[in-house]
């Protein structure tokens, strides 16, 4: 779960579960800073611009970054 | 099942000291963020402490700055809160949550059953 | 400080009554973090609404959630004995602290 203007890391929990790709709005892989040791990973979802922190380690989630990135590298030119 | 249990309660001196505990068990606890919420007698719930899933995250109430600190060891799935300088208006019934890991929403999903904290002398 | 203001401060009606309990804040929410728990005597609170007006697992359907910006309804469709209890808002999500409000008192009339 998103906490917003924290100086340190952002998320407070996070989940395992995966979500679909379909419903994603945005997808930020935040990378370990001075500000945040770790990486963190946070789905912002089409309905209602919902957040939600996802597991960096969750097999389920890596599986779900390289559906997204297939995606992408499928729509660039 | 998802549980969550409170100890380490009691009668204490003002200015001393208390360490609460809240084991957890039915969940990866090493997922969650904690909260410690109090309640004196009669009155109404008071948020007092957040810790991060990874303990990085910290926040405190205004009331506790200073002297409450909340810690955890997920290796125990135990969280904890440590207490000094008690005062008598800390009296109350002190529970830890879960914060909901799984939502895309915030909201303490699974409480402890309590412990209380008495502080008399 | 977000500060939440509940009212009433109690509400007494009848089983199979509409309750309506508000929850004021003093400045804008975002209706992601806007949560709503009943407590009974003696016992944790529970978890009733998060999100404004999403149900949380296990919460029957006569509890419904809804508002945004600074006025939050929890409205119960028609009471049932167990539903009399104290029940709380808590924004959550923008910076600590999360605050509860005072609390709404549903007691049988």
């Known amino acids: 779960v998103p906490l917003s203007r924290t100086v340190r890391c952002t998320c407070i929990s996070i989940s395992n579960q995966p979500v679909n790709p379909r419903s994603l709005e945005k997808l930020e892989i935040i990378p370990a800073s001075q500000f945040c040791p770790r990486v963190e990973i946070i789905a912002t979802m089409k309905k209602k611009g919902e957040k939600r922190c996802l597991n960096p380690e969750s097999k389920a989630i890596k599986n779900l970054l390289k559906a997204v990135s297939k995606e992408m590298s499928k729509r660039s030119p | 099942q998802v549980q969550l249990v409170e100890s380490g309660g009691g009668v204490v001196q003002p200015g001393r000291s208390l360490r609460l505990s809240c084991a957890a068990s039915g969940f990866t606890f090493s997922n969650s963020g904690m909260h410690w919420v109090r309640q004196a007698p009669g009155k109404g719930l008071e948020w007092v402490a957040l810790i991060g899933f990874d303990g990085i995250n910290e926040y405190y109430a205004d009331s506790v700055k200073g002297r409450f600190t909340i810690s955890r060891d997920n290796s125990k799935n135990t969280l904890y809160l440590q207490m000094n300088s008690l005062r008598a208006e800390d009296t109350a019934v002190y529970y830890c949550?879960?914060?909901?890991?799984?939502?895309?929403?915030?909201?303490?999903?699974?409480w402890g059953q309590g412990t209380t904290v008495t502080v008399s002398s | 400080e977000i500060v939440l203001t509940q009212s009433p401060g109690t509400l007494s009606l009848s089983p199979g009554e509409r309750a309506t309990l508000s929850c004021r804040a003093s400045?804008?929410?975002?209706?992601?973090?806007l949560a709503w728990y009943q407590q009974k005597p003696g016992q944790a609170p529970r978890l009733l609404i998060y999100g404004a007006s999403s149900r949380a697992t296990g919460i029957p359907d006569r509890f419904s959630g809804s508002g945004s910006g600074t006025d939050f309804t929890l409205t119960i469709s028609r009471l049932e004995p167990e539903d009399f209890a104290v029940y709380y808002c808590?924004?959550?999500?923008?910076?600590?602290?999360?605050?509860f409000g005072p609390g709404t008192k549903v007691d049988i009339k």
């Open positions: 949550a879960r914060d909901w890991p799984e939502g895309y929403y915030n909201g303490m999903d699974v």
């Open positions: 808590q924004q959550y999500g923008s910076s600590p602290p999360f605050t």
């Open positions: 400045q804008s929410v975002s209706s992601s973090y």
